[in-house]
């Protein structure tokens, strides 16, 4: 069966199968490099 | 079936230019966020560009390297999205892979960038 | 950006060996729905990227039981009960909760 992807709070279909957060949050360190 | 086929790639100068094309079939476009993720050997698998929904005003996210540079859009009707590449550099190099998130990839499309 | 780091590097083993490949991040990976979004893929020579098991532990449809998904927090593992030849490939975890979403660098599982 279809997933649909994970979306943002406004949308009318969101679901974690996606292995993306709704509303990822910004990293909060920057790698080296 | 959900499948992903990209095209598109092929070689460019530095500085030039590339669009890249990525058309679905078997799910429901329009509810799907559409992303390009990049490989190459010396960086690995590397997330490169996000596309939302109409209904998040197709909202965009890019990594900061190709900020100001790379523009990603979709045509819903058409079940495509795209990826535009202007100013490219040597490190932009690799295959470009479309994704809806982590779940479906398509076979990738090869771009290099060499003088 | 959230740096993944994967270990080991290469893993080298016989048919019906267990296998265990770990996944650290340098943030929690727990989202603010209480979800927490890591992911695993396997790439096989030549093939693009399948992904195994999304937040931590689900497995995908068609994925045989004897891969499994365990962790919380920073510290992720993905365990093979019994290794088969199909299974050769190269392993990421990739973290969908902060952007930009990263992977790790690939546990590559070789068959002796």
């Known amino acids: 069966s279809e997933t649909t992807t994970g979306t943002s709070s406004n949308s009318s279909q969101s679901t974690s199968n996606s292995g993306l957060a709704p509303n990822p949050t910004n990293a909060t360190t920057k790698a080296a490099g | 079936e959900v499948r992903l086929e990209e095209s598109g790639g092929g070689f460019v100068q530095p500085g030039g230019s590339m669009k890249l094309s990525c058309v679905a079939s078997?799910?429901?476009?329009?509810?799907?966020?559409m992303n390009w993720v990049r490989q190459s050997p010396e960086r690995g698998l590397a997330w490169v560009a996000q596309i939302q929904l109409k209904s998040d005003n197709y909202a965009t996210r890019y990594v900061e390297s190709v900020k100001g540079r790379f523009t990603i859009s979709r045509d819903d009707s058409e079940s495509t999205v795209y990826l535009q590449m202007n100013n490219l550099r040597a490190e932009d190099t690799g295959i470009y892979y479309c994704?809806?998130?982590?779940?479906?990839w398509g076979q990738g499309t090869t771009l290099t960038v060499s003088s | 950006d959230v740096v993944m780091t994967q270990t080991p590097l290469t893993l080298s083993l016989t048919i019906g060996q267990p296998a265990s490949i770990s996944c650290k991040s340098s943030?929690?990976?727990?989202?603010?729905?209480?979800?927490?979004?890591l992911n695993w893929l396997l790439q096989r020579p030549g093939q693009s990227p399948k992904r195994l098991i999304y937040?931590?532990?689900n497995m995908d449809s068609g994925v045989p039981d004897r891969f499994t998904g365990s962790g919380s927090g920073t510290d992720f593992t993905l365990k093979i009960s019994r290794v088969e030849a199909e299974d050769l490939g190269i392993y990421y975890c990739v973290q969908g909760t902060h952007f930009p979403y990263t992977f790790g660098g690939g546990t590559k599982l070789e068959i002796k």
């Open positions: 937040l931590v532990s």
């Open positions: 943030q929690s990976l727990l989202y603010s729905d209480g979800k927490t979004y």
């Open positions: 994704t809806t998130g982590t779940d479906y």
């Open positions: 078997g799910l429901t476009f329009p509810n799907h966020w």
